[in-house]
């Protein structure tokens, strides 16, 4: 039983647990609210649509509602889309949501608003303003919303929604919201921390601002205070991809003493890019619950040596010291202070951009005895020469990060480690700003108006590889040589990630001798050259292995590659080789007992199994265990006869997405005797089999979109009771029989995905549009682009809203 | 050279009132927190009082034992620290010393780097 | 307020000696402690501060040790002049607090 109409163009799903019904209407290019919404919708998403007004009429029915996203309906016009600007401020009539009674959460950013909208209901608790024309605010504004908690009034006045004029705060505006606990103000050309704030507030967000002093009792009252953001404010603007101006003089943002006092609950300070050169130990003395410091992109390398107030930081866990670099100099090495060692719960230390030339032992020996840390990011920092056994130190830790350094090999055989004879001149470095781009964006936790949660992603380390245990990222570096002394004394190591280096070299299964725990190498992006098969079989216990991206040998006539090197890998469970455009193979078969999962996306099985060569039909065949194989674009207009005779016989998925073919032996499938998941998608197919029953009795998923398919087949669907996921969308279907999409199999489906076809709307169609209207089966975007090409009046118009009254049709046949 | 030179102390009734001076010379006077620290007969040290320095705007800072009584100011001017005194006990007996905070980049660090000679204050009827 | 502890009153040394002073604070300071020697009829003068970094012109023979609540003042080879009296001093929090002092005596 439906209990929403299927005209209406919104996902609708239920939380059942919560007891939550939501319809997200998501970018439907809506001009109004739609017809159906159901009754019971308790949350409502009309986010990125073109709603021009909102009266007390659009919610009238729907009276549980408890969250409205309204957000982007009319974004400010540098934010929003140069193809659809957006003139006319969204109008919100009084009284609009007054009646909603169950109202919680209420977002209205990025409409061009001009105040806060009056008449909200008392159960209101969250209000969203951001990204609005909102640029003064007064006692007035915010007497109604006494009963708010989460109040959201950034990005009302900076670079991309200039305001023109100064952003004002009436004296003691926001004390009558006696129940705020989260506020707000970021991106707002602020001049000062607002005054006699609410007592109750847990979180204060004033950054990206023009603050240039916190006063001695700007926070006073603040005792519950947990989170206070106050960066970008007197900004460091060296190498920032965004207008930016620093305070005079490049003066730092000035903090009384007495300034932090209260916040004896703080959890969390962030003060990133506010050009300090110091951090007085006296900001500290009352903040024992600190659990979270920002100090990143300040002027702060001196400081690093120093650092007394770390002392005052007993439960820090979190400790953010990047890119304070001092500007045109290129330190000899990192001078961390000995107060460092105080820092006993601390998890989490990055110093990026700290930019120096030697990493060595002693340099880090204040971190020795911190117990609990698990990450230690030393990524962009321009090293030359470090010594990686001094990392055995530091068995405990998850991720040691070096990645984006200068790290190449020394010459010798000693036992020094990597380093190189590095030029003594001064240099001076600029740290790429788009290598870890969250230290360079304006603002890293801004909502997109897709998203509702915060976007910022802060785990730099690939995770599939970081959840493996200790790992050990030298990706981006200048290594072109590696050795087994290199990694003396990093047995622990689970993870080594040696991407985009510059190794070259023949491995011959020696260079990882001492890395008996690793279960997985990430060596994409070098210039492996596979000459022996014994490449890797050092790595006992390697379980995932990436090659991905080393195209550069593989690319070169005459020079032998030894796929095979897989039957060394004894655990081997996944290979990446994507991207390497393999051609040529010495080794006629890979072989291997463990292996389930092969990507060989992005090579050239087309030349390989070239037609009349039938030397690599087998390829794979002896990966006895493989479940999965990728062998999308591979430019394979056909495949020859024979292909699938020489798959593995556990195979289940297979994608052979992006390779152009033209045409697909369906009776072929029948070699696969375990396949469940087959991906033909972005190829030229122009038909589908006559009965894909007969083809394969094990197929659940059938992936067909974006091809050049007409017409389905009389029988196509026949019988084949195991599918449980058809995907024809993005083809040229005209139409669709019932003989082709027979009920007793189409009930088994979980989805089926026909958008962006070209139907025909005739008389031929009315069981086909019967049908989807009656059908439980899902079909996403049914009532917006499932669509009729023709004829004439019905161009445009959705196959499910059809009227075809003119047409005859005894159901019963 | 850094000098600070301490006067004014002498013998007053309880309930009195006396005012201290602190002359200061050889650094800027305006960039450093300022101290009372006072040291009654055969018992230790107690800081009493804090001038703020000029990025802190000269604002005070008091022990719970003078909190109402006593008050700190500066003359920048002249480079000279003042204690006022007022509603004077016996046990504000003591020796008053002036006392230079050690100064961390225009912050204070409650430790002293440089103390005057002391001037004696004695409250007896 | 943190109150800081000398147990020794005082304590008696040989020219030459080592001596060690220690000092208990009430609460944990994360060795924000000083530590000052008063001659008599003088006024006191900073020897260490962060429980163990000396002052500019302070004698090597002076060492500062210790953390959490437990401090010590340390004179390697005791010298004629620093008969004295010898003060810590809590910087963790205001008010600064002094301990009552160790009075060395010169055998």
């Known amino acids: 039983f439906r209990w929403f109409p299927k005209t209406l163009p919104c996902e609708v799903k239920v939380n059942i647990p919560e007891a939550h019904v939501i319809v997200d209407c998501t970018d439907k290019h809506l001009t109004e609210i739609p017809e159906g919404i159901p009754t019971n919708t308790t949350n409502l998403t009309l986010t990125i649509n073109h709603i021009p007004s909102i009266s007390p009429d659009s919610f009238r029915r729907l009276n549980h509602l408890e969250e409205i996203d309204l957000r982007c309906n009319c974004v400010p016009v540098l934010l929003g889309s140069k193809a659809n600007v957006c003139t006319k401020r969204l109008q919100i009539r009084p009284g609009s949501f007054s009646g909603l009674s169950d109202l919680k959460a209420l977002y209205l950013d990025g409409n061009q608003l001009l105040e806060i909208p009056q008449d909200l209901p008392s159960s209101l608790h969250l209000l969203s303003l951001e990204a609005n024309n909102i640029f003064s605010i007064t006692k007035e504004n915010l007497t109604e919303l006494v009963n708010i908690e989460t109040l959201y009034l950034g990005q009302n006045c900076y670079y991309r929604n200039p305001c023109n004029v100064s952003y004002s705060i009436e004296k003691d505006a926001f004390l009558v919201m006696r129940n705020l606990k989260v506020l707000s103000l970021k991106d707002n050309n602020v001049t000062a921390v607002p005054t006699t704030l609410p007592p109750n507030l847990l979180e204060l967000y004033l950054y990206n601002n023009i603050i240039k002093k916190i006063q001695e009792n700007d926070f006073n009252n603040l005792n519950e205070l947990q989170v206070l953001d106050l960066s970008g404010n007197c900004p460091r603007c060296y190498n920032v991809p965004y207008p930016c101006t620093p305070c005079e003089n490049n003066s730092p943002l000035q903090i009384h003493d007495n300034a932090f006092n209260s916040l004896t609950e703080l959890k969390v300070l962030r003060l990133h890019s506010n050009s300090l050169q110091h951090v007085p130990p006296t900001w500290f003395k009352n903040m024992n619950k600190l659990q979270e410091l920002d100090l990143s992109q300040n002027f702060l390398a001196k400081e690093i040596g120093d650092a007394k107030f770390l002392h005052f930081l007993p439960s820090l866990i979190q400790l953010d010291l990047s890119f304070n670099f001092e500007l045109q100099v290129y330190r000899a090495s990192m001078n961390l202070s000995q107060a460092f060692s105080s820092l006993k719960s601390l998890k989490i230390l990055r110093i990026r951009g700290y930019v120096f030339k030697e990493l060595k032992s002693f340099n880090l020996s204040p971190l020795h005895n911190l117990q609990n840390l698990e990450v230690l990011d030393l990524g962009t920092n321009f090293i030359k020469i470090a010594n990686l056994s001094m990392f055995k130190q530091f068995k405990r830790l998850k991720v040691i990060d070096l990645s984006v350094n200068k790290i190449s090999p020394s010459g010798d055989s000693s036992e020094v480690g990597f380093c190189s004879n590095a030029r003594t001149s001064v240099e001076s470095y600029e740290p790429q700003v788009l290598e870890q781009l969250h230290y360079f964006r304006y603002d890293k936790y801004a909502r997109s108006c897709r998203f509702k949660n915060k976007e910022a992603s802060f785990m730099s380390v690939n995770e599939s590889c970081y959840k493996y245990g200790q790992t050990l990222d030298l990706s981006k570096n200048s290594i072109f040589f590696v050795k087994s002394s290199d990694f003396q004394h990093l047995s622990f190591l689970k993870c080594l990630n040696l991407s985009g280096n510059l190794i070259s070299q023949t491995l011959n299964g020696s260079e990882f001798q001492p890395l008996a725990e690793l279960r997985y190498l990430d060596f994409s992006n070098n210039r492996l050259d596979l000459l022996h098969s014994t490449a890797f079989e050092e790595l006992h216990k390697l379980e995932v292995l990436d090659i991905s991206s080393n195209s550069h040998y593989f690319q070169s006539e005459g020079i032998t590659h030894m796929l095979n090197f897989t039957k060394n890998l004894k655990v081997l469970q996944k290979l990446m080789m994507n991207d390497n455009d393999i051609s040529s193979s010495t080794s006629r078969t890979m072989e291997s007992e463990s292996l389930r999962t092969l990507e060989f996306r992005g090579n050239h099985l087309d030349v390989l199994w070239r037609e009349g060569d039938n030397r690599y039909l087998q390829l794979f065949k002896n990966l006895l265990k493989l479940e999965e194989l990728d062998i999308s674009k591979n430019s394979l207009s056909f495949l020859p006869s024979g292909v699938f005779d020489g798959m593995p016989p556990n195979l289940k998925n297979l994608s052979l997405a992006k390779n152009g073919l033209k045409s697909f032996s369906w009776k072929k499938l029948q070699c696969l005797k375990n396949l469940e998941t087959l991906d033909l998608s972005h190829n030229q197919l122009t038909t589908v089999p006559e009965r894909l029953s007969n083809c394969s009795r094990s197929l659940k998923n059938l992936i067909l979109k974006n091809n050049q398919i007409r017409s389905l087949t009389k029988y196509f669907l026949q019988d084949a009771f195991q599918l449980r996921y058809l995907d024809l969308s993005s083809n040229k279907i005209q139409m669709i029989q019932k003989t082709s999409f027979p009920e007793n199999v189409l009930n088994n489906l979980k989805m089926l995905l026909l958008h962006h076809n070209r139907f025909l709307c005739t008389c031929d169609a009315v069981w086909f549009v019967w049908w989807v209207n009656h059908t439980e089966v899902t079909i996403p975007y049914l009532a917006t682009d499932v669509t009729c090409v023709g004829p004439g009046a019905h161009k445009g118009q959705s196959v499910i809203s059809l009227d075809l009254y003119t047409c005859e049709l005894d159901l019963t046949n | 050279e850094v000098k600070l030179v301490e006067s004014g102390g002498g013998l007053v009734q309880p309930g009195g009132s006396l005012r201290l001076s602190c002359t200061t010379s050889?650094?800027?006077?305006?960039?450093?927190?300022m101290e009372w620290v006072r040291q009654p007969p055969g018992k230790r040290l107690e800081w009493i009082a804090a001038?703020?320095?000029?990025?802190?705007?000269?604002?005070?800072e008091y022990s719970a034992s003078v909190k109402g009584r006593f008050i700190v100011s500066r003359d920048t001017s002249q480079n000279i620290l003042y204690l006022q005194m007022n509603a004077l006990r016996a046990e504000d007996t003591a020796i008053y010393y002036c006392?230079?905070?050690?100064?961390?980049?225009?912050?204070?660090?409650?430790?002293?780097?440089?103390w005057g000679a002391g001037t004696t204050v004695t409250v007896s009827s | 307020d943190i109150v800081m502890t000398q147990s020794h009153k005082f304590m008696s040394t040989s020219v030459g000696d080592r001596v060690s002073i220690t000092c208990k604070a009430s609460?944990?300071?994360?060795?924000?402690v000083a530590w000052y020697q008063q001659k008599p009829g003088q006024s006191p003068k900073l020897l260490i501060y962060?429980?163990?970094t000396r002052h500019t012109g302070v004698p090597d023979r002076f060492t500062g040790s210790g953390s959490g609540t437990d401090y010590t003042l340390t004179i390697s080879s005791v010298q004629a002049e620093d008969l004295a009296l010898y003060y810590c001093?809590?910087?963790?929090?205001?008010?600064?607090?002094f301990g009552g002092g160790t009075k060395l005596e010169i055998k």
């Open positions: 006392a230079r905070d050690a100064d961390y980049y225009g912050s204070s660090t409650w430790y002293f780097d440089v």
């Open positions: 050889g650094f800027t006077f305006s960039d450093f927190y």
């Open positions: 001038s703020r320095n000029k990025r802190n705007d000269h604002t005070t």
């Open positions: 609460q944990d300071v994360r060795t924000a």
């Open positions: 962060w429980a163990s």
């Open positions: 001093q809590q910087h963790y929090n205001t008010p600064p607090t």
